[in-house]
């Protein structure tokens, strides 16, 4: 639960955050797990700890291993683990899978590629961007803050993108690179006023008391990747997170699907252990984008369990 994988290349800077989060005032001690040796805090060391951060300036293959961070409040010590792997630099252009960060998708309307992990570093713009090891040049490519914007995206823009930047630590500069794949959805997109496919307006959903129930809010917003679109549930006009009922939760994240070429989003509302009082609540499926907001209301009714006779 409190273990995190991190990776980097030899002779580059690598900064790792302790997976165990605490309040800002808490101190953090780092140890190399295999030897239980404390990581120094003095910045003159190549590897040193700085609060929640562990810094390799620069990293070496021999640094690979599991590092323990202990977050200390005045009365409690809690432990996290960082599994660090430092790889040798590749002589050829191919970036192996184990060095790749999560893939991102884009389209003509939305082509941002964020540079992974950059928020951990002390860097200054501009970033350098490479595609398949070639420096990106031309007016279609714009390095903006911590991301790359590609104008007029085409299918040929798919590939592996590497961001390169300089981390500065007390006047010394260290190179950092990070690579992720970019895929392109090749479509001419447009945006519509949201259309809610489910639930139907004023739908009554039958549920069994004591059982779990799922409600799906599904809406379509147009064709292609949508710049601003969201579906969510409200209870009695209140956001789920503010309602404060831990049994009723929205599914983490929104599922994106393309139905008949349309861009649609789903949000599942999960009700654990349905109670009588749940039947009194108003469940609103909300779909919104730049055109506006549409709302469909659902209510729950008791479903009488069917008697089974042998």
């Amino acid at each position: 639960k409190f273990s995190k994988q991190s990776w980097g290349l030899e002779n580059e800077a690598l900064i790792v955050r302790c997976p165990r989060q605490g309040k800002p005032s808490y101190t953090v001690d780092w140890y190399y797990s295999q030897t239980n040796k404390s990581i120094p805090t003095q910045e003159r060391n190549r590897v040193f700890a700085s609060g929640q951060l562990l810094k390799f300036l620069p990293a070496a293959v021999a640094d690979s291993g599991i590092y323990t961070c202990i977050v200390r409040s005045p009365t409690f010590n809690r432990t996290g683990y960082a599994n660090v792997t430092i790889y040798k630099k590749q002589s050829d252009c191919n970036v192996p899978d184990y060095l790749m960060y999560s893939t991102v998708s884009g389209s003509e309307k939305n082509s941002k590629i964020y540079c992974p992990t950059i928020d951990l570093y002390n860097w200054t713009a501009p970033l350098e961007w490479f595609k398949n090891c070639q420096a990106l040049q031309g007016s279609r490519y714009r390095a903006h803050k911590s991301f790359l914007v590609i104008d007029n995206v085409m299918t040929e823009d798919a590939g592996d993108y590497t961001c390169k930047f300089i981390h500065n630590e007390n006047g010394a500069n260290y190179s950092v690179t990070a690579t992720r794949s970019f895929t392109v959805k090749d479509e001419q997109g447009f945006s519509l006023f949201p259309v809610i496919g489910a639930p139907a307006q004023n739908e009554i959903k039958e549920v069994e008391i004591g059982k779990n129930a799922n409600l799906t809010c599904s809406a379509c917003f147009g064709k292609g990747t949508q710049f601003l679109a969201a579906v969510l549930w409200q209870l009695n006009g209140t956001k789920i997170t503010d309602f404060g009922e831990p049994r009723i939760q929205q599914e983490e994240g929104q599922n994106q699907s393309f139905s008949n070429g349309l861009a649609c989003l789903d949000m599942v509302l999960r009700i654990a252990d349905v109670k009588e009082e749940d039947l009194l609540l108003q469940y609103d499926c909300l779909a919104l984008n730049l055109h506006g907001l549409r709302r469909h209301t659902v209510r729950l009714s008791r479903k009488n369990p069917i008697d089974h006779h042998s």
Partner: antibody, heavy 123, light 107 residues
Framework: EVQLLESGGGLVQPGGSLRLSCAAS????????MIWVRQAPGKGLEWVSS????????YYADSVKGRFTISRDNSKNTLYLQMNSLRAEDTAVYYC????????????????WGQGTLVTVSS | EIVLTQSPATLSLSPGERATLSCRAS??????LAWYQQKPGQAPRLLIY???NRATGIPARFSGSGSGTDFTLTISSLEPEDFAVYYC?????????FGQGTKVEIK
């Protein structure tokens, strides 16, 4: 020294209301999540409600949802529990307690507890 | 909600003996489990957090172990002041839940 002092308990008829208070001292009250836990006579511990620090998000046990309201006044270092529509089964010692760690979306243990205040619901 | 089941309900032992208390969760709580001690007329006192870490000021004779669904509180050698009721509590998710308690009494 961290101290939590509950007050406001007493005898109330079924259907009645009470407001419990918990005065906190010895720590920066506003940054800590606070919790109410109750214990019926001769029974075990039951979590009642939690409130986040400055964010103020609230959580309730099913048994009190819609009847009890947790709140806090950070300027007065005080935690409250407004109890309405009281029932005989709400009879218990009510403790306020501190969660010393929790970050957004997480919970932790209860490291400091008050001495408790007895609420008796009876006609 | 996550149900915590403690066993045994009562443990009758003599001072100096070893006490082993069990707490089983209905689903995994990772290591998000605590143990409390409660004496009559007093508020609970935190003993163990994160399944195995002793809280500040807790004697070394108290130790916790386990992860996932099965947890144990061990008192290596009972002192007279250790006779009390012990509760486990999970904090991986709301609602926070407690076990029903194990009473450690003098034999």
């Amino acid at each position: 020294e961290v101290q939590l002092l509950e007050s406001g308990g007493g005898l109330v008829q079924p259907g009645g209301s009470l407001r419990l208070s918990c005065a906190a001292s010895g720590f920066t009250f506003s940054i800590y999540d606070m919790i109410w836990v109750r214990q019926a006579p001769g029974k075990g511990l039951e979590w009642v409600s939690s409130i986040r620090g400055e964010g103020g998000g609230t959580y309730y046990a099913d048994s009190v949802k819609g009847r009890f309201t947790i709140s806090r006044d950070n300027s007065k270092n005080t935690l409250y529990l407004q109890m309405n529509s009281l029932r005989a089964e709400d009879t218990a010692v009510y403790y306020c307690a501190r969660d010393p760690w929790s970050t957004e979306g997480s919970f932790f243990v209860l490291d400091y507890w008050g001495q408790g205040t007895l609420v008796t619901v009876s006609s | 909600e996550i149900v915590l089941t403690q066993s045994p309900a009562t443990l009758s032992l003599s001072p100096g003996e070893r006490a082993t208390l069990s707490c089983r969760a209905s689903q995994s709580v990772d290591d998000d489990l605590a143990w409390y001690q409660q004496k009559p007329g007093q508020a609970p006192r935190l003993l163990i957090y994160d399944a195995s870490n002793r809280a500040t000021g807790i004697p070394a004779r108290f130790s916790g172990s386990g992860s996932g669904t099965d947890f144990t509180l061990t008192i290596s050698s009972l002192e007279p002041e250790d006779f009390a009721v012990y509760y486990c509590q999970q904090y991986i998710t709301a609602p926070l839940t407690f076990g029903q308690g194990t009473k450690v009494e003098i034999k």
